[in-house]
């Protein structure tokens, strides 16, 4: 077989057609997509493309420039009339660049055999493209049958002379692929047996996926497999100030394009996800943990002065339980429980009390009673010591009511009930709760039990009770409690010497209900049973006593 | 009661250098940002600088920048503005004011200043 | 830099009456619905003293009679009825991005 070596094809003006056809076709270059990496774009190239052509008179290049005085390379053949035409034009070294799966994109013009006169015997519409791997940059003299075929090229598209009069172009684009590719490099060859060709453009790139960031991971520029089905499997890595809980692939498909992806990062505590990147949080924001999507203000009752911070700071007089998360606001101990009353029975106390006015902001309220023994003369207190039982129980009441038995007859007795929260352990402030000081009694006051109501306005209620059948002892005051019924909650406490009291800033008509007990030296009585009397209406008169049975 | 008490100025040659400090009480140093803010004879507030609590943020004025350091030691309750290369346009007094904790902060407490005379 | 433009730069007004202040901010100073706006008031030879925050907060201990309002770059600091210890000067500040930037300060006198 003959030798493809041979010396550079001289450029020789080119007919007409070629040059209308070439300066109309080329002025189109588009640019390449941003997942083909070219080898070779034969039209920017700037110099000598260092081309070969065997046997010289075959293929011979056309020294054309385009509208910015580009050299244009173009190739053309048209040996129609001749028979037996073998015609090669062999590229220089084309190196992969570690492809091993390349594209080669030809852009040519055929002429129709039909419309030459003469040559239809041995005129062609199809020429033959090869390619022949090497490591070599100098190892073009090579043997045609060492040349791999990689097709047979027909043009879509061919012209004839009409076509040719009217300027109108017909440049066909083929693409073909070779692959697997295992040496560093290649040559391309294009065999002529009897067209009329004109060879605008050769282009040979591979395919990659572009670099990427998707879900904050950064996946590199990843060349495509050879085999055409091929999925690549490619590890991302994590963005600045990201992590990740599953290291995050994706899949880079045959045709340059990032499929299936898997895993993710995330912006870690203290950053947050903005156009692609973890940014900082700002003084003032906080992020607890990578799985929170963004900064999110501080709490109620802190703060942060800090880039990046993960929790923020209490702020005076606030805490936080280690339990409590991040994001909840800080809290402060309750204030002191209110109206506290107290109900002795010989030697047990019940005392009862409402939450107070201030829970700190917290859920978790109970209650610790402390019990002090005191000695009415000296004035000194003591603890009350073991032998005193708390019904239910002393500390984490959630009640609003405790029970103590067992106490000593005729003793004046302290209680203070304080009230606790999640944070009171973390305050060295001052304790907070209310006292009630009692006097055990075997015998306190009976209750009260005949009560008159007197004047009735729309705003008050007078009543008049009388003492209590069994005083036990000279009757020191009286307790009034009373609330508007069906708010037992929210009640008022009256005292009075007498028995008689008006009760004043009422609402008008309503019901409220009363509830009297006396106290002597020896301690309160039980309360009386509940005595419901309504105020009046805006513009009712008013109303004057009846006895209530 | 929080106070904020500032020292170490005084007349200084241009290109010299001064140490400033501010002595916190009253409140947890550790946890506030604190800026110092100049203020020239007769002219408006300036902000020079901040540094966060733990040291972790800090920022500067353009005016200032690769001149001035701010600095804090917590163990001391103190902050510092280090002052390099003086020019006379940094006469003023000097003020350092804690960040507040009700958000957006501003600066809550101001010390009565420290005065800075920078003069051949 | 965001430059802070205040306006007037003083101004005289009667005992009693409503002063108005008025400052500008080179671009917005809000960020995630709030406003990063701060006023100070001065005395001569005394420290500032921050009044409001937020654009629109009052500082605790500070009287009600100052308030503040705005958002984005148009911002107005109010007394609605001048007392004599408000003679002062007073600031501006956006803290929204460092440099935190001060306006140039307005002189207020008691007609």
């Known amino acids: 077989p003959a030798s493809l070596a041979g010396c550079y094809s001289a450029p020789r003006r080119a007919p007409l057609w070629t040059c209308l056809l070439l300066c109309a076709a080329l002025r189109t270059l588009l640019a390449s997509p941003s997942n083909e990496v070219n080898l070779l774009d034969s039209r920017t190239v700037m110099g000598d493309l260092g081309w070969i052509a065997f046997p010289k008179n075959g293929w011979e290049e056309i020294g054309e420039v385009d509208e910015n005085y580009a050299p244009i390379h173009t190739y053309q053949v048209c040996k129609v009339m001749e028979q037996n035409q073998n015609n090669w034009l062999l590229t220089s070294w084309i190196s992969n660049e570690g492809a091993s799966r390349i594209f080669i994109e030809l852009k040519f013009t055929l002429r129709d055999c039909n419309s030459l006169p003469g040559g239809l015997g041995t005129c062609k519409e199809t020429f033959n493209m090869y390619y022949f791997e090497s490591d070599d940059q100098n190892g073009r003299n090579i043997k045609e049958n060492q040349y791999i075929k990689i097709d047979t090229i027909a043009a879509d598209e061919s012209f004839t002379e009409l076509d040719l009069g009217d300027r109108v172009m017909k440049l066909n684009t083929e693409v073909r692929d070779v692959g697997p590719l295992s040496k560093k490099g290649f040559y391309l060859a294009f065999q002529d047996v009897g067209a009329c060709i004109a060879l605008v453009s050769v282009r040979v790139y591979y395919k990659k996926c572009p670099s990427v960031v998707r879900h904050l991971a950064v996946f590199p520029d990843t060349i495509t497999g050879a085999d055409s089905s091929q999925l690549l499997e490619v590890s991302g890595s994590c963005v600045n100030h990201s992590v990740t809980d599953e290291p995050p692939k994706m899949h880079c498909s045959a045709e340059g394009e990032w499929l299936v992806p898997i895993g993710k990062c995330m912006c870690k505590a203290g950053y947050e996800e903005k156009n692609g990147t973890c940014q900082v949080c700002r003084p003032g924001f906080f992020k607890a943990s990578p799985h929170i999507q963004s900064c999110g203000k501080c709490p109620p009752h802190s703060y942060t002065h800090e880039e990046a911070s993960t929790s923020c700071v209490c702020e005076k007089d606030y805490f936080r339980r280690e339990s409590d998360p991040p994001t909840m606001a800080c809290t402060r101990p309750p204030s002191a429980p209110r109206n506290a009353i107290s109900n002795v029975n010989e030697t047990s106390v019940f005392l009862e009390w409402i939450p107070p006015a201030d829970t700190g902001g917290r859920k978790d309220v109970s209650y610790y009673i402390a019990c002090k023994k005191c000695n009415s003369h000296a004035g000194v207190c003591e603890e009350c010591g073991g032998h005193v039982r708390y019904l239910p129980r002393q500390s984490g009441l959630k009640n609003t009511s405790v029970m103590m038995v067992d106490l000593l007859a005729h003793t004046n007795y302290t209680f203070e009930i304080e009230a606790v929260n999640g944070v009171s352990d973390l305050s060295p402030g001052a304790r907070q709760y209310v006292s009630v000081n009692v006097t055990t009694n075997q015998a306190a006051p009976s209750p009260v039990t005949n009560v008159k109501k007197g004047k009735i306005a729309k705003n008050s209620i007078s009543l008049s009770w009388q003492e209590p059948d069994r005083p036990n002892g000279i009757i020191l005051e009286y307790e009034i409690k009373y609330f508007e019924k069906d708010q037992e909650t929210s009640y008022t406490i009256i005292k009075s010497k007498e028995t008689t009291i008006t009760a004043e800033g009422l609402k008008p008509a309503s019901v409220y209900v009363f509830q009297i007990r006396a106290r002597t030296a020896a301690g309160y009585g039980v309360f009386s049973r509940r005595f419901e009397f309504e105020t009046t209406p805006v513009f009712a008169a008013s109303s004057d006593q009846s006895q209530i049975p | 009661e929080v106070q904020l008490v500032e020292s170490g100025g005084g007349l200084v040659q241009p290109g010299g250098s001064l140490k400033l400090s501010c002595a916190a009480s009253g409140f947890t140093f550790s946890t506030f940002g604190i800026h110092w803010v100049r203020q020239a004879p007769g002219k408006g507030l300036e902000w020079v600088a901040y540094i966060s609590g733990a040291s972790t943020t800090i920022y500067y004025a353009d005016t200032v920048k690769g001149r001035f350091t701010i600095s804090r030691d917590n163990s001391k309750n103190t902050l510092y503005l280090q002052m390099n290369s003086l020019r006379s346009e940094d006469t003023a007094m000097y003020y350092c004011?804690?960040?507040?904790?009700?958000?957006?902060?501003?600066?809550?407490?101001w010390g009565q200043g420290t005065l800075v005379t920078v003069s051949s | 830099d965001i430059v802070m433009t205040q306006s007037p730069g003083s101004l005289a007004v009667s005992l009693g009456e409503r002063a108005t202040i008025n400052c500008k901010a080179s671009?917005?100073?809000?960020?995630?619905?709030?406003?990063?706006m701060n006023w100070y008031q001065q005395k001569p030879g005394k420290a500032p003293k921050l009044l409001i925050y937020?654009?629109?907060n009052l500082e605790s201990g500070i009287p009600d009679r100052f308030s503040g309002s705005g958002s984005g770059t148009d911002f107005t600091l109010t007394i609605s009825r001048l007392e004599e210890e408000d003679a002062a000067s007073y600031y501006c500040?956006?803290?929204?991005?460092?440099?935190?930037?001060f306006g140039q300060g307005t002189k207020l006198e008691i007609k």
């Open positions: 671009q917005s100073v809000d960020y995630d619905g709030d406003s990063y």
């Open positions: 004011a804690r960040y507040g904790t009700s958000f957006p902060y501003g600066l809550d407490y």
């Open positions: 500040q956006q803290s929204n991005e460092d440099p935190f930037t």
């Open positions: 937020g654009a629109s």
